[in-house]
Interface confidence: medium
């Protein structure tokens, strides 16, 4: 009989029902929007908005300040009041839109939907290791502002994204809104701008470049701005918009637009479509050939990344990536598979395919047919010319034109669709040590840090605890401040550290030792914790063997017994090969020999289940007793393994010593030729791992075997004449004297 | 006009290391991935490693991966080749082209011969 | 395995239109392919990107008589009326980046004579 171990699935070794406390601010309404700063001189805040307030918070996430931003209209309102006696324009509540800092001063400067967009300008006053608002400066300025030309209005209630570039003395503004015809004819915001902010802070400086939805299109076609940011020499905006002008609307994919950070100008401004699939590595019939496409970008962010994460994307480490998780459409309704999926975009890859795609469109060979694109924003055209016109006329460049190029950026789920059902609705990338954590929020208002990894079948998981009990998404921007990142769900900001919770979701020694040393985990006698958590006993260098079962569960008093152990930290190596002395088994008061490894029978493990074995022939001592005793393993004096050694003692109980007695044996004749089915009939017949029944010295071929009975097929006989037989358990003759006689036939 | 001038070949012996070096000039070098093909006596091409415009990211053909390192000096116009562990099946004539989107090599230069022999 | 074949060698009379075929492997069929000419004692030079389709644009100083056409997996290069200027080495590549790795692969080229 062969009889293996089974398998205990990976996620045994881990528990993410566990409950932790992080610490968290309660705002009083919704988080509209939150941004953090560290100043240096070890000063730091947390700036938390929500409808019609703003809230300072201190490192310790404690309330530092409040200041009301509306309704618009409300004598109330702090902000309102920086810009003079009003009426500003119509009553109403303020949603922050635009929460951004601005290095340069530094500021922090907020954008509402109320009061046309406009926004307010706060200076940081350093208060000890907290961070005050100085009074607010409002950005605007009446007198060169109209309806139609409007350069103090920035946010768009239909959503705005902003990253504030210095450029020499001055900052300017990096502006995308979303407009439908509504939004575009009540001053004119536009789609995306740059603009310099006035250095007398009374707004921003008229005669700005911008790009906008044209009229025919504002109805159709919706441009959703998910994520920007600067890194180089550029400025990116994430887009969600429809494939096509022409096409149904509601067939949407996702975009990254690049501007110069350089230049103050849109002439270079490309835009480049992202492609994110997944790819699974069995592909089902009928599964589309390039994988399943994920077209609209839920939420992303941009990182270095670490050394196994860039030798997997062909990158060096340290270069910057762009992370999205991406969903089939708008509702991110589940699809064959996985709800949401993670795609990495290299950003020199993404600027190398841009360069080339302009190359593409200005330089010779012309391409015919090739479409200069963002038929929304300009005149349609074909490269090489610029938009609506037919030719290059001597003066202009094809390249100081807008441009999409023609080519898209494709690459596939990062995880391999190993996040199924979870609907991912936040993110943010680290790099720690070497490895690159993916931080992501939940649509249930967990928090999943993972590391991004690209050649397993499974998630290696830094933690996944809930965030609260409300359950409420984790909202889409997050911020990271010293060593946390702070998440925004329902009312609250959680603060997060970067390097997990804790470690009480590890349940045992073998995963507490193996997780990442960034994490500070130890062992502490019963549970895995950081030292903080459990003094005194608290150790990250050994962890002692682990059984879970045993098999067979008797065996003879008399006789060996082949025992097959099973559990974890046996060996710490997958040849499963031990050195002399190191392992001590004892049942009772009897050892068991441990037996080499059958190299036949090894078998590899997915990394997703484990199990070891170790074998070892019993031979009970003289003194040995009948009845139930232990099993135990100790092993000493083993050769570290890569991340703990294994040292110390493992007892279960529930291994029992028997007698086999051998009570009636029938027939006792039968042909000579053989084949006589026998039936032994006793107690303790089937103790044990080996039994063999002998008639004249050879063995009966065993049919059954149970705890009160055998059945064997007799041999053939030499002659005919009355031979002895006996049973063996465990190579010991079970007593008592039986005769078997064989007949002619 | 696109000039790609390649330096840098010879005789060495086998387990020697040598760097190519390749010159451009009548294009925005910085914008471009470039990469390394060679061609074998027997006129067989065989492309050996890329690199993108910004220099981050780099693709090698299999049997060179470790051996060979390509890498790029956009404020020189100049891409390299360092070439370590070399064996007699790297003996080739080797070019520098200019990629458009790394998938093809619109131009080349006159290539430099790296012979391993002992 | 990404594969390309070229039959290698084809001779054409002065003045007739020349067809030089590559074949991509089987699971490959939908790819775009570039193809190179090689003179005599020169570096290969850029022909044209050639689609599954057929289109093609043709690289810098190529003359109109070289085109492009596409069937299945075999992808094809005609030039009309051959001139001496013509014999030279023409071989296809191909492209493809798997799970964030790039390849490139050559075919092994077809060495083209005008008697």
């Known amino acids: 009989e062969d009889w293996q171990c089974p398998r205990t699935p990976y996620a045994a070794s881990r528990d993410f029902d566990v409950k932790y406390v992080v610490p968290s601010f309660s705002a009083g309404g919704l988080v509209q929007a939150m941004v953090t700063y560290e100043g240096d001189r070890n000063e730091s805040a947390v700036f938390v908005a929500i409808r019609n307030r703003l809230h300072v918070l201190g490192p310790d996430l404690k309330s530092v300040q409040s200041l009301a931003t509306g309704p618009a209209g409300d004598p109330g309102c702090q902000t309102c009041a920086a810009c003079g006696p009003g009426p500003h324009g119509p009553p109403g509540d303020t949603d922050t839109k635009v929460l951004v800092l601005d290095p340069a001063l530094p500021a922090l400067v907020s954008c509402g939907s109320s009061l046309q967009g406009r926004c307010f300008l706060h200076d940081l006053e350093p208060q000890g290791t907290a961070v005050h608002l100085a009074a607010p400066a409002c950005l605007f300025s009446a007198h060169h502002n109209r309806p139609d030309d409007c350069p103090d209005c920035v946010a768009s209630p239909l959503g705005t994204r902003v990253t504030v570039v210095e450029q020499g003395q001055a900052s300017y503004f990096y502006v995308a809104s979303s407009l439908d015809a509504a939004v575009a004819a009540s001053f004119s915001p536009r789609s995306v701008s740059i603009r310099r902010l006035k250095a007398d802070a009374s707004g921003f400086a008229p005669g700005f470049v911008a790009l906008s939805v044209l009229p025919k299109h504002l109805v159709s076609y919706s441009i959703e701005y998910v994520h920007s940011f600067h890194t180089g020499a550029f400025v990116y905006f994430l887009t969600v918009q429809p494939a096509s002008v022409t096409d149904d609307p509601s067939a949407l994919h996702t975009r990254l637009a690049r501007l110069s950070a350089t230049e103050p100008e849109l002439g270079d401004y490309r835009e480049l479509v992202l492609d994110c699939r997944f790819a699974p590595k069995r592909r089902r019939r009928g599964a589309p050939e390039g994988g399943q496409p994920y077209p609209v970008l839920r939420v992303a962010h941009s990182a270095p990344v670490g050394a196994q994460l860039a030798t997997e994307l062909s990158i060096a480490e340290g270069q910057e990536v762009l992370f999205g998780v991406f969903v089939t459409g708008k509702d991110g309704g589940p699809g064959v598979g996985p709800n949401s999926v993670v795609c990495a975009f290299p950003i020199d890859l993404l600027d190398t395919l841009i360069d080339e795609g302009v190359e593409r469109c200005c330089e010779s060979p012309v391409h015919p047919g090739l479409r200069r694109g963002l038929d929304f924003f300009q005149s349609p055209s074909f490269c090489p010319n610029p938009p609506g016109l037919e030719a290059l006329s001597p003066n202009t460049s094809c390249r100081h034109f807008p441009l999409l190029v023609s080519s898209s950026f494709s690459r596939v789920d990062l995880f391999n669709g190993l996040l199924g059902p979870v609907q991912v609705t936040a993110l943010y990338v680290t790099r720690l040590d070497n490895v690159t954590v993916a931080h992501m929020g939940t649509m249930d208002g967990r928090i999943l840090q993972v590391e991004l990894v690209r050649s397993l079948n499974y998630l290696l998981y830094v933690s996944n605890f809930s965030l609260g009990d409300s359950g409420q998404p984790v909202q889409r921007d997050v911020s990271r401040l010293g060593d946390h990142l702070l998440f925004a769900s329902g009312d609250q900001v959680f603060q997060v550290p970067i390097q997990g919770p804790g470690c009480r979701h590890f349940l045992t020694c073998g995963r507490c030792l193996r997780a990442w040393h960034f994490m500070g985990c130890g062992w502490c006698g019963n549970m895995c914790g950081q030292q903080k958590e459990c003094p005194g006993s608290w150790q990250q260098d050994h962890c002692p063997p682990k059984l879970t079962e045993f098999h067979p569960h008797s065996g003879p008093l008399r006789g060996s017994t082949r025992l097959t152990l099973c559990g974890s930290n046996f060996y710490l190596h997958p040849s499963g090969l031990v050195p002399e002395g190191t392992h001590q088994v004892t049942v009772g008061q009897s050892p068991c020999r441990p037996l080499p490894k059958d190299s036949s029978k090894l078998r590899p493990v997915p990394r997703k289940d484990f199990v070891e074995e170790f074998e070892c022939e019993l031979e009970p001592l003289g003194t040995q007793a009948v009845g139930p005793t232990n099993v135990s393993l100790t092993v000493t004096n083993m050769p570290p393994g890569k991340h703990f050694r294994v040292d110390g003692t493992s007892v279960l109980r529930g291994f029992s010593f028997m007698e086999p007695v051998l009570i009636a044996v029938q027939p006792l004749f039968g042909p000579r030729a053989g084949g006589t089915c026998l039936t032994l009939e006793g107690q303790s017949l089937s103790v044990g791992t080996s039994r063999a029944v002998l008639v004249n010295g050879t063995e009966c071929l065993l049919a059954r075997v149970s705890e009160g009975q055998l059945l064997c097929a007799t041999p053939p006989g030499a002659t005919v004449a009355s031979v002895p037989l006996s049973l063996q358990v465990g190579g010991a003759q079970v007593p008592g004297s039986w005769t078997f006689q064989y007949r002619e036939d | 006009e696109v000039k790609l001038v390649e330096s840098g070949g010879g005789l060495v012996k086998p387990g020697a290391s040598l760097k190519l070096s390749c010159a451009a000039s009548?294009?925005?070098?910085?914008?471009?991935?470039m990469s390394w093909v060679r061609q074998t006596s027997d006129k067989r091409l065989e492309w050996v490693a890329s690199?993108?415009?910004?220099?981050?990211?780099?693709y090698y053909l299999d049997t060179v991966k470790g051996r060979f390192t390509i890498s790029r000096e956009n404020a020189k116009d100049t891409l390299y080749l360092q070439m370590s562990g070399l064996k007699s099946e790297d003996t080739a004539l080797y070019y520098c082209?200019?990629?458009?989107?790394?998938?093809?090599?619109?131009?080349w230069g006159q290539g430099t011969l790296v012979t391993v022999s002992a | 395995q990404l594969v390309l074949t070229q039959s290698s060698s084809a001779s054409f009379s002065l003045g007739a239109s020349a067809k030089l075929t590559c074949t991509l492997s089987s699971q490959h069929t939908t790819y775009t392919i570039e193809w190179y000419q090689q003179l005599p004692l020169k570096p290969p030079k850029y022909v044209m990107e050639?689609?599954?389709?057929?289109?093609?644009s043709t690289g810098v100083g190529i003359p109109d008589r070289f085109s492009g056409s596409s069937s299945g997996a075999d992808r094809y290069l005609t030039i009309s009326n051959i001139q001496p200027e013509d014999e030279a080495i023409y071989i296809c590549g191909v492209g493809e980046t798997i799970e964030d790795q790039f390849v490139y692969v050559f075919g092994g080229g077809t060495k083209v004579t005008v008697l």
């Open positions: 009548g294009f925005i070098f910085s914008s471009y991935g």
């Open positions: 050639l689609k599954k389709d057929g289109s093609h």
């Open positions: 690199i993108s415009s910004g220099g981050g990211t780099t």
């Open positions: 082209t200019r990629g458009q989107w790394l998938l093809k090599f619109a131009y």
